[in-house]
């Protein structure tokens, strides 16, 4: 089972950690999938990005995903581990000046083109069972993740335990 | 301050088996994932057994895959190592460590001054 | 599998020498990479993690730099206390250590 402890405990530091840095610590290219090995594609429709979960014809390209990844800094207060309360967070760019953001109040998961510093909702705290089976929280909003419902990706509420073995909230990160 | 003290090793004979402790202090201990890594008289560093913050889910090295179980006792801020059908390949000094983030398995950020394992008849 | 192969095995250098550690794996690993310091008699220490970040507290004569398949960890100017043994660690898929460079002085 894939699970991922502390949910509540850290809502109120979740919400108060900061970036440390302005730049990101490392940075690579890698295509996303889903568990279940659906792809993750990105289209340019009428000038906005969609975003769609969808089996590959054999030969068909991956699209690829810029991931920044960016330490943050929990306050000692709130982690009990001084300075050592780090967390990874990440943001998703699968083309230029565009980024995954988490809208919350509509559940869902868009590409909105915007400049640096980018707002808080394109950022994820990286989770993982493996180096490449992964899942993202929002920083805006602790125990939402970005999951997949109907062939979209969605945020979806993870409120306990047991839900947190879900396959529709991890997904593949790969070179090809 | 963040530390990690191991306990539980010693020689034992071919065969039999061993329990190695790892009690963490100094961090919040649930939100981190925790390992084993031996080390070999002499010899480089194994990475032997990895365990995500809630337990869930277990790594091994393939050579001790069957014999070796971790497992963690949140509660207790305790990370263990059951070591069975000990071989004489196992003798090593092991260490426990922390991950270096909250969530992932990225990185040793601290290790424990290690427990000697002697495996011989 | 992932293999990590560092070179030299043994690098002797003089006080105040620019020296560099080389680590190659057999497949990309997009700098999911560390390095430890390992002292005689000591546990390991965290030096760099995700090839070129230093960890707190660690001299800023330590640097790395690498991507895909290939890694260095520099030491501007040797100095004694830096004597020891160096791993490269991969994360990137499952977990492996290279097998060490035993830097010496002169």
């Known amino acids: 089972a894939f699970g991922i402890s502390g949910v509540q405990k850290y809502t109120r530091a979740l919400h108060d950690s900061s970036i440390t840095g302005i730049s990101p610590i490392t940075e690579y290219l890698a295509s996303l999938s889903t568990y279940n090995d659906q792809s993750i594609t990105f289209a340019l429709e009428d000038e906005s990005y969609e975003i769609y979960v969808e089996d590959l014809k054999k030969d068909e390209k991956k699209d690829k995903v810029l991931l920044s990844y960016y330490e943050s800094q929990h306050p000692s207060n709130e982690s009990g581990d001084g300075v050592d309360g780090k967390m990874l967070m990440v943001t998703l760019s699968p083309t230029k000046d565009f980024w995954l953001h988490a809208n919350n109040k509509e559940h869902s998961v868009e590409l909105h083109k915007c400049e640096k510093p980018l707002p808080d909702q394109a950022f994820f705290v990286l989770h993982n069972m493996h180096s490449n089976c992964v899942s993202f929280e929002c920083k805006t909003d602790p125990g939402v993740f970005i999951g997949v419902k109907d062939n979209h990706l969605a945020l979806i509420k993870v409120d306990s335990s047991e839900n947190l073995c879900t396959e529709n909230i991890l997904f593949k990160l790969s070179e090809t | 301050e963040v530390q990690l003290v191991e306990t539980g090793g010693g020689l034992v004979q071919p065969g039999r088996s061993l329990k190695l402790s790892c009690v963490a202090s100094g961090f919040t201990f649930s939100n981190y994932w925790m390992y084993w890594i031996r080390q070999a008289p002499g010899m480089g560093l194994e990475w032997v057994s990895s365990?995500?913050?809630?337990?869930?889910?277990?790594y091994y090295l393939d050579s001790v895959k069957g014999r070796f179980t971790i497992s963690r006792n949140n509660a207790e801020n305790t990370v263990y190592l059951q070591m069975n059908s000990l071989r004489s390949e196992d003798t090593a000094t092991y260490y426990c460590?922390?991950?270096?983030?909250?969530?992932?398995?990225?990185?040793?950020?601290?290790w424990g001054q290690g427990t000697l394992v002697t495996v011989s008849s | 599998d992932i293999q990590m192969t560092q070179s030299p095995s043994v690098l002797s250098a003089s006080v105040g020498d620019r020296v560099t550690l080389s680590c190659k794996a057999s497949h990309n690993i997009n700098k999911h990479l560390d390095w430890y310091q390992q002292k005689v008699g000591e546990a390991p220490k965290l030096l760099i993690y995700f090839t070129n970040n230093l960890q707190t507290g660690i001299p800023s004569r330590f640097s790395g730099s690498g991507s895909g398949t290939d890694y260095t960890l520099t030491i501007s100017s040797l100095q004694p206390e830096d004597v020891a043994t160096y791993f490269c660690?991969?994360?990137?898929?499952?977990?492996?250590f290279g097998q060490g460079t035993k830097v010496e002085i002169k």
């Open positions: 365990i995500n913050n809630d337990g869930g889910n277990t």
């Open positions: 460590a922390k991950g270096h983030y909250y969530y992932t398995s990225y990185s040793f950020a601290y």
């Open positions: 660690f991969q994360y990137n898929s499952g977990w492996t």
